[in-house]
């Protein structure tokens, strides 16, 4: 039975040209995290495997930095980066947990962070 929950940074906004940290946290389970995959709609951004370390997809290698922790730092933001991002936690023995973050990249300096929220 999957008892864990994923807490994410929720709906966030950031300025064009700036950077943002995408972060998820798995709680309420003793399952071992074997890997975290970061995805944007239909493409992979990065993988952090507990044994092997990080894989950064070539399309993002100049703009994505691993961390902090299992999170991901997205740099040199453009308006095209607006959209949904997913953290996919591969765990043993529970299986897979998925968290969702919506990022809006704004032209002006009115960007504000959204509230944190939980996905069961």
């Amino acid at each position: 039975m999957m008892t864990g929950t994923i807490e994410t940074t929720g709906n966030i906004s950031a300025e064009k040209g700036g950077s943002i940290i995408l972060q998820c946290h798995l709680s309420s389970t003793t399952a071992q995290v074997t890997q975290v995959n970061w995805e944007q709609q239909d493409q992979l951004l990065a993988i952090c495997n507990a044994d092997l370390g990080w894989h950064i997809s070539p399309s993002f290698k100049d703009r994505v930095a691993p961390g902090p922790g299992l999170g991901l730092t997205l740099q040199s933001l453009t308006v095209n980066d607006t959209g949904e991002y997913f953290c996919i936690y591969h765990t043993y023995p529970d299986g897979t947990y998925t968290g969702r973050i919506f990022l809006e990249v704004l032209e002006s300096s009115v960007a504000e962070h959204g509230a944190r929220f939980q996905i069961p």
Epitope: T34, Q35, N37, E39, D42, Q43, L44, A46, I47, N49, A50, D51, L52, G53, W54, H55, I56, S57, P58, S59, K61, P66, H90
Partner: antibody, heavy 119, light 107 residues
């Protein structure tokens, strides 16, 4: 330039063990991942496992779990694949492959090592 | 484990033909797929990764596409040196796995 050079062909009896080496040159060994793949005669590629020489972290194919061990010696820039309790269906060419930095894309390959298991 | 199923298993074609090889994953693998080319008695060579980037030195007649579970490798105009076996490979989640291969033969 990056090179992976594997040890020579081996002939083993069923039940024995084999240890194949993969010596790396031309790069910082600990910045790479080394994976092992085998290919039985006339068959396709079978993924065996992968090691991060920097951390020693490993991951193995479930089918081989318990029989295979991947290690790396940072002092000699050499990765090793040991397979125990050999059976005739372990007869194959064993390849090592390397991937640099933050990537799971393996673009450097060893020349392959033929391991023959026969009584 | 994630199964990678290639089709067709073998294919006969002529020089100049356009050829498409498909690879279907048993579950979502996003864009964590690469393609290798292997000739008899040789180590595989990386062709395409992620899954639409051509590796250094790979001719532009090779292209790849796909996301999620369905992937394709296309050779726009077959050359004599392209007759080989092609494999897809997923690195989305361990254990990583290969397709069974597609043997491309001269018609």
């Amino acid at each position: 330039q990056v090179q992976l050079v594997q040890s020579g062909a081996e002939v083993k009896k069923p039940g024995a063990s084999v240890k194949v080496s993969c010596k790396a040159s031309g790069y910082a060994f600990t910045n790479y991942l080394i994976e092992w793949i085998r290919q039985a005669p006339g068959q396709g590629l079978e993924w065996m496992g992968v090691i991060n020489p920097g951390s020693g972290g490993t991951n193995y194919a479930q089918k081989l779990q318990g029989r295979v061990t991947l290690t790396a010696d940072k002092s000699t820039n050499t990765a090793y694949m040991e397979l125990r309790s050999l059976r005739s269906d372990d007869t194959a060419v064993y390849f090592c492959a390397g991937s640099y930095g933050s990537s799971y894309t393996f673009d450097y390959w060893g020349q392959g090592t033929l391991v023959t298991v026969s009584s | 484990d994630i199964q990678m199923t290639q089709s067709p298993s073998s294919l006969s074609a002529s020089v100049g033909d356009r050829v498409t090889i498909t690879c279907r994953a048993s579950q979502h693998v996003s864009t964590a797929v690469v393609w290798y080319q292997q000739k008899p008695g040789k180590a595989p060579k990386l062709l395409i990764y992620s899954p639409s980037y051509r590796y250094t030195g790979v001719p532009s007649r090779f292209s790849g596409s796909g996301s999620g579970t369905d992937f394709t490798l296309t050779i726009s105009s077959l050359q004599p040196e392209d007759f080989a076996t092609y494999y897809c490979h997923q690195h989305y989640s361990t254990p990583w796995t290969f397709g069974q291969g597609t043997k491309l033969e001269i018609k």
